[in-house]
């Protein structure tokens, strides 16, 4: 399929002008290469009429132009003073020859329609209302008024002042006078449908003294707005239907031959094919709304229509707006995993691509919710605090310049299953959808922390160990202190007098963190994790409680210690950084030699973890998982 896109059918009237926009993929080569407009001949040859190289054919001289808009990845062909001879098949395209990339366009130029003298032309869109003005002389002020529609030679009455209304105009047509006006009557026809188009005659009085006016009504199908989007990107349909339908249910549907299948409406209907990747946003009280679809697929290309009706379904005679969506498969958006799988108690690291030209943009991660219109509350962002209920288990790691950021979610529960969106406040095309599937764990987690009774005493030394399997042997291990603006990896060199170290026990694949001496500010969530360069892997979390040194301090149950996270005071939740100048972390690669497991510690951790789960609520278990 050619990545060039434009209008398939263009129609106009003799003497008028047309403007044809053609879209091309946003690449440097495409921006600079030759653009052309040629006419397809019967012999298969396409004769150039105009090109961006400056060529202009004789028949287009003085009436056509071709303008490239590289910033929009479009070029526009303007043709004026159209004649019926311009009717034909054309191509708009790119390349040094007319056999390059192109899109076929059919142009039809019709004769100017002929109407009886003094015919007033009314042009209205489907679903709208027309007001036909009928003038009469004073002599017919008290005579019967009527509006009829010409059908061949006959003229069938639509409505008259005796309150007759043709059944096909029932509840749609009204005849009225305005104020004190004695020389005009009006006929309103609402909810216009294509078959309403035609020639109307309004009349006041009977016989030769009657006053007659001709009105030609043209009912226009909505001209589809062309939307050119990359595969995996997102599209927004901005729908503005007007105040008159502000209180009616809204919908977006996709045309399918004769029908239009609803994709989403404000009454809660949603096509399963768009689950997790669609949002409908009411914009204001004037009937405006927008529908956002992310993760565009090849099969999403097609004709779309938005509308309003109390049923939330397409209805003839109600206003609509139309689009034609083209999905360019030559996408700049990288193909990332659309489904990520995790297990309860485990973690996931989700890589979110963004436009590399916008590394300073703010990054966000939201959870798509299937309420009636769909919504996506932001859970974390570069300038957004972690959503309540996700403290200690969610962090966003920006990797400037890499064109991606990573979101890590740990302490997974089955309730975390669902759809999530990666997005930035920059290029809105780069919105990707990920489905997270969390299954019940069937084995021990890869990372385990001991002790699970993580209570440190101020002024003393506190060591916590993270057990990892041999498969992580070659990966970098780290401890980080979680805060509301990320998880700050503990520094790997001494930046202060205080001893806080991370070391690995050669005999048992352990990476340990030591706080020495413990301070009140050390309280909070700590993560143990593995990574390879900027690729983050498994993590596990533990809440370290800090208490004053007291004689005969009671032993705190690990469940209680970790449950504090849920009720952590705001100051703790808001803590913004690890005191890097006072923490030291040493990860010595020489210490990762032995592949022996410590069975007992593992079994003990498993047992404690189970009790930790039992005492937690809302999937926010504080125990190390």
């Amino acid at each position: 399929q050619s990545p060039i896109f434009g209008p398939q059918d263009v129609s106009s009237i003799e003497g008028n002008s047309v403007s044809i926009t053609c879209y091309y993929p946003d690449t440097s080569v495409n921006r600079h290469t030759r653009k052309y407009w040629c006419r397809q001949g019967a012999n298969g040859y396409c004769a150039t009429l105009i090109s961006s190289n400056g060529y202009l054919s004789k028949e287009y001289s003085g009436r056509a132009s071709l303008i490239n808009f590289p910033e929009n990845s479009t070029f526009v062909i303007n043709i004026a003073h159209l004649t019926q001879e311009d009717t034909g098949s054309y191509k708009c395209g790119l390349g040094t020859t007319n056999r390059g990339l192109f899109f076929d366009v059919s142009l039809e130029v019709s004769q100017v329609p002929e109407f009886p003298n003094d015919t007033h032309v009314y042009t209205k869109d489907i679903g709208r209302t027309v007001t036909i003005e009928c003038r009469f002389k004073e002599g017919n002020a008290h005579s019967k008024k009527s509006l009829c529609k010409k059908r061949g030679e006959a003229c069938e009455v639509v409505i008259d002042s005796t309150e007759y209304v043709d059944p096909s105009y029932k509840d749609r047509a009204i005849l009225f006078m305005k104020g004190t006006s004695r020389d005009i009557f009006y006929v309103n026809i609402s909810h216009l449908i294509p078959s309403d188009a035609g020639l109307y005659v309004c009349q006041a009085g009977e016989g030769p003294s009657a006053d007659k006016n001709n009105a030609d009504l043209q009912v226009l199908e909505p001209e589809p707005e062309l939307l050119y989007k990359d595969l995996r990107s997102s599209v927004t349909f901005e729908c503005d239907l007007g105040r008159e339908v502000a209180n009616d249910a809204k919908y977006l549907c996709r045309k399918n031959k004769e029908t239009c299948d609803v994709i989403i409406n404000t009454l809660g209907k949603r096509d399963p094919a768009f689950e997790g990747r669609i949002l409908l946003t009411p914009r204001d009280d004037n009937g405006r709304f927008s529908v956002l679809i992310t993760g565009l697929r090849k099969e999403d290309a097609g004709h779309y229509q938005c509308g309003a009706h109390s049923s939330g379904l397409p209805q003839e005679g109600w206003p609509v707006q139309a689009w034609q969506l083209f999905v360019n498969e030559e996408s700049t958006i990288p193909n990332s995993r659309s489904v990520v799988k995790g297990v309860t108690g485990g973690s996931v690291a989700i890589v979110c691509p963004y436009n590399p030209k916008e590394s300073s943009s703010l990054k966000y991660w939201c959870h798509w919710e299937a309420d009636e219109n769909g919504r996506c509350p932001v859970l974390v962002g570069t300038q957004a605090l972690v959503q309540e209920g996700y403290e200690g288990r969610l962090a966003l790691f920006d990797q400037p310049g890499s064109g991606a950021y990573t979101v890590i979610l740990n302490q997974l529960t089955t309730q975390d299953s669902g759809f999530y969106w990666c997005l930035t406040d920059g290029d809105s095309r780069w919105r990707t959808t990920i489905e997270l599937q969390v299954a019940e764990a069937t084995k021990k987690p890869d990372l385990e922390v001991t002790p699970q009774n993580a209570t440190a005493v101020i002024g003393e030394t506190f060591t916590i160990s993270c057990h990892y399997p041999c498969k992580f042997y070659s990966q970098e291990k780290y401890w980080c202190k979680w805060s509301n603006d990320g998880c700050h990896i503990l520094p790997s060199h001494d930046e202060g007098a205080r001893q806080s170290s991370v070391s690995c026990d050669q005999s048992s694949q352990i990476v340990s963190m030591t706080l020495n001496p413990v301070k009140k500010e050390d309280e909070g969530w700590y993560w143990c994790g593995v990574k390879e360069g900027q690729v983050y892997g498994e993590t596990t979390a533990i809440y370290v409680a800090v208490e004053e040194r007291t004689r005969g301090s009671p032993h705190i149950n690990p469940t209680d210690a970790n449950a504090r996270a849920k009720d952590a005071p705001e100051e703790e939740a808001m803590e913004s950084s690890v005191r890097e100048d006072e923490n030291k972390a040493n990860l010595d690669p020489r210490l990762f030699a032995d592949e022996r497991e410590i069975q007992n510690a593992g079994d003990q951790a498993q047992e404690n973890r189970a009790s930790g789960n039992a005492g937690s609520a809302g999937g926010q278990s504080g125990s190390s998982k």
Partner: nanobody
Framework: EVQLVESGGGLVQAGGSLRLSCAAS????????MGWFRQAPGKEREFVAA????????DYADSVKGRFTISRDNAKNTVYLQMDSLKPEDTAVYYC????????????????????????WGQGTQVTVSS
């Protein structure tokens, strides 16, 4: 409920600058779109500037465009109004306002210049520009 406290007002000469701050209480600051309004003596309160909850979208009254800049620091629960090239007609009490929009993708770019759409208001800070 959020409490808003404005500061940074004062007396300044025409052509000078001031930076107003509005500190908000509570953890959910980043679920509010924020705005600045002002009221000159004997006049109606009028819109000055607004910023979306992400900080990614801003809007200004025509009279201050190019001179005033609104910004926010969600980590500090604070919204700022940098006022440069001040004119005597900028003299007014400046109010900070918050609109509850929720931290949602659908409200990422929402800013409002309409007084009635704001849910919480500060007490105001006086700005006087002398000629």
């Amino acid at each position: 409920e959020v409490q808003l406290v404005e500061s940074g007002g004062g007396l300044v000469q025409a052509g000078g600058s001031l930076r107003l701050s509005c500190a908000a209480s509570g953890r959910t600051f980043d679920s509010y779109a924020m705005g600045w309004f002002r009221q000159a003596p004997g006049k109606e309160r009028e819109f000055v500037a607004a910023i979306s909850w992400t900080g990614g979208s801003t809007d200004y009254a025509d009279s201050v465009k190019g001179r005033f800049t609104i910004s926010r620091d969600n980590a500090k629960n604070t919204v700022y109004l940098q006022m440069d090239s001040l004119k005597p007609e900028d003299t007014a009490v400046y109010y900070c306002a918050a609109e509850v929009v929720g931290r949602d993708v659908t409200t990422m770019y929402r800013v409002s210049g309409l007084e009635y759409e704001y849910d919480y208001w500060g007490q105001g800070t006086q700005v006087t520009v002398s000629s």
